[in-house]
Interface confidence: low
């Protein structure tokens, strides 16, 4: 902004400047120029002298002690020397004049003191008017601007020295400039006085609810130029979380309810993600609605989600003691895609309907591909015991399971196992043989399950006899056999569902009889 110290165009009466010489040089006139009455000074020395030396001095211009630099703006008209009759103008015709100044702490009255004036510039017209312009009544005004720097006294005078130009000094304005109070980059900069030269760096103050950028450019700064212009903005303020730049860019306004702004890198307030809300203005995060959560590591920009419902349509298919469990994904995934499944196995006494006691399955039960963190809705189970009762529980979980008070989303199925796989692939093995007994064992049977009513039936035969024997364990001691005799043995399992198939026939031979020492005479 400009602070005017003197402006002749606003003068309501005569200016009364000092003229030297008092006559035949500069003279004050009131003229209508382009429709406006103005008090101006003219000098058009036509007397044909080579050494025209006309001076005009302003009144004392009070500067105060504020501005060390003032600006002068002249509006003037210079007549083209060629426009005079004859085309050459008077002898010594010039088209320039000189601007000078003198500092003083007080008004020195009517003493001109020419030697104390310092020249500022030679003022030249970039356009001069011709006879044609005079006839048409349109006078071209030239504007000259210059600056007076490093002023130290309380006031100054301007002087105009005319060495021979035909000139009209239409207006003279003396002013200094301040960089006005302004807003830039959400920062307020105070009204600032420029320095005597160069730029003055000024720190800005962030507007309410704004703070300086953490970037290298940092706190907002601007530079006040000698011409009163703010230049080279560096850095800026950003609305703090919960606020955004208003439409005019001159304030930070609170995010409306239902929206949020989490950090200064986000340009605007964002609508709350699904299943979340911001009740009040100025939210930095939207809180999840009841029953909805964000998983650890999910930022405020992510929609809130819920735990899944239970898996559906849990079914199984068994083959021997192998089992395949299948199910369908939950009807409600909670709005997430990271649903995982966990399978728990319990072995029970009695059927599920009996409600007998259950305990976790032993280490021999194996799940493929695993029992936890399953991404596909199926699992294979190996290592189950025949004729045992099992309950399988399948639970659906996602990234927000367990964050609230909701129960487990699971479904169960109870299964009574049937026959084991055929014993045809299993082998009877001889543990020990003697002349009259054989000790045998067979592979493939697992530790007996609680409550399972299983026995094994052995079929033993040789050329002379056939016998059947029941045992509870997968081993047997056959006694009262013939020495050095081959026996054919096979085994099968007897279950509540009936007998299983026999194993293949195995041949075992007892040891020869132990020879007793011969006694003499016999």
């Amino acid at each position: 902004k400009e602070v005017t110290l003197m402006d002749t165009s606003k003068a309501q009466g005569e200016l009364g400047w000092l003229l030297d010489p008092p006559k035949d040089g500069w003279s004050e006139q009131q003229q209508i120029l382009n429709g406006t009455p103005l008090y101006m000074y003219q000098d058009c020395p036509m007397q044909g002298r080579r050494d025209t030396d006309h001076w005009l001095r302003s009144n004392w211009i009070y500067r105060g002690e504020e501005a060390s630099r003032v600006h002068v703006e002249l509006q003037f008209t210079v007549r083209d020397c060629k426009s005079f009759p004859g085309g050459a103008g008077p002898l010594g015709c010039k088209e320039t004049f000189n601007l000078l100044y003198m500092e003083s702490d007080q008004d020195v009255g009517i003493q001109l003191r020419r030697p104390l004036f310092q020249k500022v510039t030679t003022v030249a017209a970039d356009q001069s008017f011709t006879i044609r312009d005079l006839v048409s009544g349109s006078v071209k005004l030239n504007v000259e601007r210059c600056s007076l720097g490093r002023l130290t006294r309380r006031g100054l005078y301007l002087a105009f020295h005319n060495p021979g130009a035909c000139v009209a000094l239409v207006s003279v304005r003396v002013f200094y400039q301040r960089c006005p109070e302004t807003l830039n980059g959400l920062a307020q900069f105070p009204d600032t006085l420029p320095g005597p030269a160069g730029l003055v760096e000024v720190a800005g103050t962030c507007l309410p609810h704004a703070r300086a950028s953490p970037r290298p450019s940092g706190a907002p700064r601007m530079h006040c130029s000698p011409d009163g212009e703010w230049l080279v903005p560096v850095g800026r303020c950003h609305c703090e979380p919960g606020y955004e730049e208003g439409g005019s860019g001159e304030a930070c306004v609170a995010c409306p309810s239902g929206s949020y702004r989490m950090d200064m890198d986000t340009p605007h307030c964002l609508t709350c993600p699904q299943q979340s809300t911001a009740e009040s203005e100025g939210a930095t995060i939207c809180t999840c609605e009841s029953g909805h959560y964000r998983a650890p590591g999910e930022g405020p920009q992510v929609a809130c989600t819920g735990p899944p419902s239970a898996p559906r349509n849990l079914s199984f298919s068994a083959s021997g003691t192998q089992l395949s469990l299948r199910w369908e994904p939950p009807a409600d995934t909670g709005g997430r895609q990271d649903v995982r499944y966990s399978v728990r196995c319990s072995q029970c006494q009695g059927t599920a309907q009996d409600g007998g006691p259950c305990q976790p399955c032993g280490v021999g039960v194996h799940f493929s591909p695993g029992a936890r963190g399953l991404t596909t809705p199926a699992v294979h189970v190996n290592g189950l015991e025949p004729y045992a009762n099992y309950t399988f529980n399948v639970e659906a979980q996602n990234g927000v399971s367990g964050l609230g008070s909701s129960g487990h989303a699971s479904t169960s199925v109870s299964i009574s196992m049937g026959h084991a796989e055929s014993l045809s692939g299993l082998s009877l093995r001889l543990v020990k043989k003697e002349p009259r007994q054989l000790e045998l064992t067979w592979a493939g049977s697992r530790p007996r399950s609680p409550g399972a009513n299983l026995t094994y039936e052995l079929h033993v035969l040789n050329q002379d006899e056939e016998r059947y024997q029941m045992v509870l364990e997968p081993r047997v001691l056959l006694t009262e056999l013939q020495p050095d005799t081959t026996y054919i043995v096979r085994v099968r399992m007897l279950t509540p569902l009936g007998p299983g198939p026999f194993s293949p026939d195995h041949e075992f031979r007892t040891s020869p009889p132990v020879s007793r020492g011969l006694t003499g005479g016999e």
Partner: antibody, heavy 121, light 106 residues
Amino acid sequence: QVQLLQSGAEVKKPGASVKVPCKASGYTFTSRAMSWVRQAPGQGLEWMGWINTNTGNPTYAQGFTGRFVFSLDTSVSTAYLQISSLKAEDTAVYYCARVRLTVYGDGMDVWGQGTLVTVSS
Amino acid sequence: EIVLTQSPATLSVSPGERATLSCRASQSVSSNPAWYQQKPGQAPRLLIYGLSTRATGIPDRFSASGSGTDFTLTISRVEPEDFAVYYCQQYGPSWTFGQGTKVEIK
């Protein structure tokens, strides 16, 4: 790397509809808005609008309201442009482009390869 | 709606020469436009956005300047791969593109 993959060319009859998918990969789909840009044969670029991939809220440029619908399926990181009641003048290449928002100015920093939609009877 | 007018429509330059593309806004705009490059049969590519920031992978021979209503994209030394159509784009409540300047081999 960051990619926007659009479907192949479509030939449709006037009055029909077309749905152009734009599948994003290599970045968090919901972290950036998606713009749609039209380029008629031999012509310049026309901004059609954009969709906020977080809220699904679309913004349509002048001249692209009514028959043009932007939509999303965030579960498959895909934005869609549906044009109904197709006209011959809808024949153009349609681009999806990821928006880069900054405090100082915006631009579209990743573009799909474009889908040519030809409307002809 | 702000209209962007690009000139010239076609600019013929030789490789190694300087190319200056103009983009004029129908009214003063508060920020510099973004600039894009498009080669035949390809999608546009972002060159410059924001405060004359080059996009990732854009060589430093591309620069932008201007303010108010007059903006310029300068290619300091045109390389063979720079022959393409260039678009300026302003942002605000609605985005608009200029009609494009084709840079062709002289």
